[in-house]
Interface confidence: medium
């Protein structure tokens, strides 16, 4: 807390300019009017205030706006945003995408700080849903943003927003998140033709059910092994050798290198060995000839 002291004669600030950097902390407190600061916030960022001086400026704004800063001030916070706590930000009502962009720019190139996470949360809650423009902005600054959301939060993403998602935005998503995103992507891209559809849907396929994988196998998509390895194990297990061969096309040879890893390992265990042998890849571990295969999961479903 800065002590309240009278402003020395002739030092009262008429505007926010470079001369203020030579003011001591108590002089800034005493000589800079908070309302003047609020109206000239856009100048603060251009002036090389020290961290200590920024603390004083923040204190003045906090006193002027105890219930939270107005958006006109928030938009021009610049580096002063780094001084804000999540508690400060929870008082804000940020509705403009331009304000959001301006503040994200301050944190650009770095991991999401608690301040940024709180800011985004406030913004998205204020909008009611994660619309396309917001998602565009957030994933541009934070490619991993989508994957930081819970499945519940992802459920508020409208299918139209999925167009903004790039493959790298899904790199860190887990299966539960892809389970939510995949149906939205399927809906969003439903009017595209086969090859274009596959290009768009590919990075979401970690959430695809068996029937959709079966359908894709009929479309000569030539799925690469990296995508195949990210598929849900439970979705891959029911696929036949012929369906996997069609799904992967020329990439089927890659199964050999992945035979010890899920989902390939588990899928091999479910196939007849003589069916696997038809691939000519030397895959081992299938069900020997003459053995009866009981699908217990099917039996349970029937009973």
């Amino acid at each position: 807390e800065v002590e309240k002291t009278a402003c020395p004669s002739g030092k009262k600030a008429r505007e926010i300019d470079e001369s203020l950097i030579f003011y001591k902390k108590w002089e800034l407190e005493a000589c800079v009017d908070a309302a003047l600061l609020a109206t000239q916030m856009d100048r603060v960022n251009a002036i090389p205030f020290t961290y200590e001086q920024l603390d004083v400026l923040k204190h003045k704004l906090d006193e002027l706006y105890p219930q939270g800063y107005p958006e006109s001030v928030i938009q021009h916070l610049g580096y002063l945003f780094l001084k804000m706590s999540p508690e400060d930000i929870r008082k804000w009502n940020v509705t403009s995408l331009e304000t959001l962009k301006a503040l994200l720019e301050v944190n650009k190139g770095h991991e999401m700080s608690p301040q940024v996470a709180t800011l985004i949360d406030r913004f998205v809650k204020g909008r009611g849903q994660l619309d396309k423009d917001t998602l565009d902005t957030l994933t541009a600054f934070y490619p991993g943003y989508l994957c930081s959301l819970s499945p519940e939060e992802l459920s508020s993403v409208p299918p139209s927003s999925i167009w903004a998602v790039r493959p790298q935005d899904l790199d860190t998503c887990d299966p539960r998140q892809l389970d939510v995103l995949y149906p939205k992507a399927r809906l969003a891209f439903q009017n595209m033709n086969g090859s274009e559809y596959f290009v768009k849907i590919q990075s979401f396929l970690g959430g695809a059910p068996t029937e959709d994988l079966k359908a894709l196998s009929q479309q000569n998509v030539s799925m690469d092994l990296a995508t195949f390895m990210k598929l849900r194990t439970d979705a891959v297990l029911p696929l036949t050798v012929a369906e996997v061969q069609k799904l992967l096309g020329p990439h089927v040879e890659g199964l050999k290198a992945e035979e010890r890893h899920r989902p390939v390992r588990d899928w091999i265990l479910r196939q007849r060995q003589d069916d696997l042998d038809t691939l000519g890849l030397g895959l081992q571990g299938g069900i020997p000839n003459g053995y009866l295969v009981l699908d217990l999961s099917m039996q349970e479903a029937l009973s």
């Epitope: 030579f22 902390k25 251009a46 090389p48 020290t50 200590e52 580096y79 770095h110």
Partner: antibody
Amino acid sequence: EVQLVESGGGLVQPGGSLRLSCAASGFDFSRYWMSWVRQAPGKGLEWIGEINPDSSTIVYTPSLKDKFIISRDNAKNTLYLQMNSLRAEDTALYYCARRGSHYYGYRTGYFDVWGAGTTVTVSS
Amino acid sequence: DVVMTQSPAFLSVTPGEKVTMTCSASSSVSYMYWHQQKPDQAPKLLIYDTSNLASGVPVRFSGSGSGTDFTFTISRMEAEDAATYYCQQWSSYPPTFGGGTKVEIK
């Protein structure tokens, strides 16, 4: 290699002028605040002033404000110090220095790269 | 201006010896910075934010302190450490430097 090389120093008569240059290399000059610092013989280091990346903000130590002019040319990766009305007490080794950039891009409170300096002697 | 007072002004030490110097600020500062200058060379940043080692600086150098009193230490003096060491603050404008501590090898 990150480097700053000053030039333009020399002998000048009292009342005369001189322009020092500082050539930057090995880093994105256009992203950094740059400073001039001087050291008179047998004295300590004295900060002269600084300039922001796009030249929109220039700050001088109050006692030198009307006598020195700092400028930069980002296209040439060069910082300048125009010195006018020189006096004997301006005799010093003049350094250019880069102001460190904080993790978030905000300028820090230290000089992380220095030049070796150029000597200015004011004498009749 | 914040006046920085460094002491001692001069130190003569033997290799392997511990070296300690202090810097006192006329008013409280948040951080201290330390620079090394060898004859006819550019100054070099050693310590930033009071105690953090700048990139490539050997771990025998360290810094500590708070408020107005700060310390710079070389745990085991080496011949190549012979230089003048300056403290610096930038908690308020203008940034100011100490007068320097010259360290020589005995």
